[in-house]
């Protein structure tokens, strides 16, 4: 298949059509639950998602939703108390109308004449907005995750089925399959579909084999495929890297622990804006790259790549993606240079002709037996203590 084209402006919601047509799956999702198969029921109305009305929520609708989401049948259908007190009871006879426009706008209901999603209809403004919300817990609590890839948007593909996390076999695994995974997880689109051994092998069962998604499915379990067979081993666990995953490198320095900061995000390498590049950000990056701590933030060069990423860290995060970050999709960093960093594990610190040495005194552990003290910006001597 052709690989899915990355959108200009990322939209991490599923790529369903804007309006539900008969024959399509229900425009429903479950939120604030323990998995994608439990939670508050929301229905899509044109471009927005709205909580479904609890007053008209029944077992048929619950069953239909669970089936439509590939979550088996419904285990429990309930109503969630509204975030604000419910509206007063009907007004006494003779009172003037209290029906405010906001109230009349109302909440949508999912009304089903049977337990099959094709027999359901989304009815707008069916309930008063302040009423209870529909909730459901489905029997088959299915979920999906990416593990051991350094973030929630890259790694080995694992599905939760029958209470157990398991892998997906890499036979026929391609970008369309990975695209469904990425979109389902809110991780954008697939940058890479990886065969086994790119990530650590799994340990549990292998839930799926011969997965063959079109790329349009909302959930991985909607894709054609076979149950995991015995001839698939964990050395064949499928993996994915999604556009929202961030990975970093330092370029143009003496080694991998020094240079210009570059982040791979949404399919391309980007430089990082130095207007918000401070010691805390440099520290997090050096540590996450296994390069020790940050020794210096040298003056940056003009952006050689698209420079659109900003980070703001407190210094305790494990990776830059755990920091507060923003990616400006339309403008390059205004009046800024590309961030650079020198980490303590860089071999340029061993070199006596290092062009720049930090002005402040920093103590850096290079090896357990040697400590280097850098005293003076002018003096390029290293004193071994």
């Amino acid at each position: 298949h052709p690989s899915p084209a990355p959108p200009d402006q990322l939209n991490t919601s599923s790529a369903e059509s804007e309006l539900w047509e008969p024959g399509e799956r229900l425009p429903v999702r479950l939120t604030n639950g323990s998995s994608s198969c439990s939670g508050t029921v929301e229905v899509r109305l044109e471009a927005s998602w709205e909580p479904a009305c609890g007053a008209l929520w029944d077992s048929r609708a619950a069953e239909a939703v669970c089936r439509a989401l590939g979550c088996g049948g419904a285990e429990a259908a309930s109503q969630l108390a509204p975030p604000t007190p419910e509206l007063p009871p009907p007004p006494a006879a003779g009172n003037t109308s209290v029906a405010a426009n906001a109230t009349l706008a109302g909440a949508p209901a999912l009304l089903c004449s049977g337990a099959e999603w094709r027999l359901c209809e989304v009815v707008e403004h069916a309930c008063r907005s302040d009423g209870r919300r529909a909730r459901v817990t489905c029997a088959e609590n299915r979920a999906l995750r990416l593990v051991d890839g350094g973030g929630a948007c890259a790694g080995r593909v694992e599905m939760l089925e029958h209470g157990e996390w398991g892998s997906v076999c890499d036979d026929t695994w391609d970008l369309e399959d990975a695209h469904v995974v990425c979109r389902q997880l809110g991780c954008g689109w697939a940058v890479q579909a990886l065969p086994g051994l790119h990530f650590t092998p799994g340990r549990g069962p292998i839930h799926r084999d011969q997965v063959n998604c079109s790329g349009a499915e909302a959930y991985l379990w909607d894709c054609p495929g076979l149950p995991g067979q015995h001839y698939c081993g964990h050395k064949e666990d499928a993996g994915a890297v999604c556009s929202e995953h961030q990975s970093w490198r330092l370029t143009g320095g003496a080694d991998r622990c020094e240079g210009q900061v570059e982040v791979h995000f949404r399919g391309v390498w980007n430089t990082v804006c130095d207007s918000e590049w401070y010691p805390s950000e440099a520290k997090v990056l050096c540590q996450s790259l296994g390069c020790g701590t940050a020794v210096e933030r040298p003056k940056g060069l003009p952006h050689s790549l698209s420079g659109r990423m900003y980070y703001s860290c407190n210094g305790e995060e494990l990776t830059l993606s755990n920091c507060s970050w923003r990616f400006n999709n339309s403008n390059l960093c205004s009046q800024s240079l590309a961030a650079r960093v020198l980490c303590s594990a860089s071999r340029s610190l061993h070199n006596l002709s290092t062009p720049e040495v930090p002005a402040s005194v920093q103590t850096v552990t290079i090896e357990s037996s040697v400590t280097v003290k850098i005293e003076n910006k002018e003096s390029r001597e290293l004193m071994l203590l």
């Epitope: 009305c53 007053a55 009907p90 006879a93 003779g94 009172n95 109302g106 209901a109 403004h125 069916a126």
Partner: nanobody, 123 residues
Amino acid sequence: QVQLVESGGGLVQPGGSLRLSCSASERTFSDYAMGWFRQAPGKEREFVAAINWVGGSTYYADSVKGRFTISRDNSKNTLYLQMNSLRAEDTAVYYCVASWGAMPVLTHVINYWGKGTLVTVSS
């Protein structure tokens, strides 16, 4: 207390049409979502059609979809059910219902019931 009074029932031949009306005593008629239920002899009461407060949303039972049309006139405090292509199985007592919190699709949300009007479809 909202008083609901149905009218317009009667005997009609298969394939014929009838228009039921439901007049509400309440000046706050527009605060209520309205609907119709029916009960055939020896059967349980079943949902027919519902309409929200302002009339912008409607919902029908599968058995009447495309044949029946529910509407309301808030200025006249009146609910209507236009029934076309009537069949023998549409024979029942038709009840007008009013609901404060939600469209009256399920019986537990209904606040008020009318006394009913009989529709008989027979040749």
